[in-house]
């Protein structure tokens, strides 16, 4: 610090020590540091009834350092502030206060919400979702063939999750019924394990369909049951042609 200031203090304090403790430029037995070595900050610490001068390389919590020509001084932050750059800008508030625009507040202003992790007032964030993706193909029980009425689904992504006071997210998937022209399942398309030949009972509104499978069938002779199935298939094809599809998606 300022040398002339140090000399002036030595005249004022007859009990000034020459062997000052760490960082002090001048000191007294009663008051501790009176001035500091260059770049160190001077702060008064209250010990009982007296104040002791201390020299530090940086100011303690709740204080900030200012460099003047004659002294580098630690100045107290505002009462509700733990860490600050200066009196105008708090960077961390004391417990129970929320930081907003460099100030410490008991409650966050209208339109903002308290973040209890960072102890800051933050903008309320509402949910944001993407546009709907295209409808999926019309399916039934995971298959795209062998039926007439199924369901199709579309999804959208959550682009921004809402904060505590933000608007909740709308549904991210939608399902609707669809009708398609029946498409015969190709060999292996139904993907039944072990190629079970056992016929499934028809679903409500869905007629039986023969499983074309030549394996294990002895002759080309038709059983009465097979003959009946063939006739029903022909009938169905005529009906399907007459009835237009109402689905918006195509069957792949």
């Amino acid at each position: 610090q300022n040398a002339s200031r140090g000399r002036r203090q030595r005249r004022m304090h007859p009990n000034v020590s020459q062997g000052c403790q760490g960082g002090c430029a001048t000191c007294s037995d009663y008051n501790g540091c009176l001035s500091c070595k260059p770049r160190l900050f001077f702060v008064l610490e209250r010990i009982g009834m007296k104040q002791i001068g201390v020299c530090l390389s940086s100011c303690p919590s709740g204080y900030y350092g200012t460099r003047y020509p004659d002294i580098n001084k630690c100045t107290k932050c505002k009462a509700d502030c733990d860490t600050c750059f200066n009196k105008n800008f708090c960077t961390k508030c004391k417990s129970g206060f929320y930081l907003h625009l460099g100030k410490c507040l008991d409650n966050c202003p209208e339109g903002l919400e308290a973040n209890n992790h960072t102890m800051e007032c933050v903008n309320i964030v509402h949910c944001e979702v993407s546009e709907w993706n295209p409808w999926s193909p019309c399916t039934k029980k995971g298959k795209t063939c062998g039926f007439k009425r199924g369901t199709e689904t579309r999804v959208r992504e959550i682009m921004q999750h809402p904060s505590a006071k933000g608007n909740l997210c709308p549904p991210t998937n939608e399902t609707r019924k669809c009708t398609v022209q029946r498409k015969k399942c190709q060999k292996g398309e139904r993907g039944k394990k072990g190629r079970e030949r056992k016929r499934k009972k028809p679903n409500k509104g869905e007629s039986k369909e023969a499983i074309p499978d030549s394996k294990g069938l002895e002759s080309s002779k038709e059983t009465p049951e097979q003959r009946e199935n063939k006739q029903q298939q022909k009938k169905r094809k005529v009906q399907d042609k007459q009835q237009k599809s109402v689905s918006v998606s195509t069957v792949h």
């Epitope: 200012t66 460099r67 003047y68 004659d70 750059f85 200066n86 009196k87 105008n88 800008f89």
Partner: antibody, heavy 116, light 107 residues
Framework: EVQLVESGGGLVQPGRSLKLSCAAS????????MAWVRQAPKKGLEWVAT????????YYRDSVKGRFTISRANAKSTLYLQMDSLRSEDTATYYC?????????WGQGVMVTVSS | DIQMTQSPASLSASLGETVTIECRAS??????LAWYQQKPGNSPQLLIY???SLIHGVPSRFSGSGSGTQFSLKINNLQSEDVASYFC?????????FGAGTKLELK
Amino acid sequence: EVQLVESGGGLVQPGRSLKLSCAASGFTFSDYDMAWVRQAPKKGLEWVATIIYDGSRTYYRDSVKGRFTISRANAKSTLYLQMDSLRSEDTATYYCATHDKTFDYWGQGVMVTVSS
Amino acid sequence: DIQMTQSPASLSASLGETVTIECRASEDIYSDLAWYQQKPGNSPQLLIYDVNSLIHGVPSRFSGSGSGTQFSLKINNLQSEDVASYFCQQYDNYPNTFGAGTKLELK
């Protein structure tokens, strides 16, 4: 809302005096160190003087030492700059500002022209 | 006194561009550096303190960096409202000194 309003500027002859005032509102004036900063036409910023919050210490740039005096009236929330022996190089817009390491709040400025 | 040398003195850039302004201190000022913006006809306004801490309300396209003697202010995605003069200031030592300024204009 913090407001700093300067007044007292004008045209003055070299060697004469002028006193600038700065009326502060919207903050606790007596808590803050205050400063005057000037800006010559089409030039940069230049710190002139600072007075600490209670008025007990003042600091000046070398070129104005002995000619300018910074003072404050905390009861009136007003900052002053007494400028004596003015020179042509003192021609500038003078701003009053809070000075706490940085100059956080500024007035709108007042023009001082020193010319014969 | 600590001299603050700012460059360039003026620069012209297009909307959406990134611009960088440099500031050099004549001696080590640690991280005691601030940046100010002064729009035509207005008072200066503090933008950044402690090299890279943005003042509340300053758009995030502004950023500061550096330490010791070399510092810079970067403006990403330049907007028309960024047309102004920019000044650096050191507060490590009295007298607090400013750079001469950089005048930023639109192409």
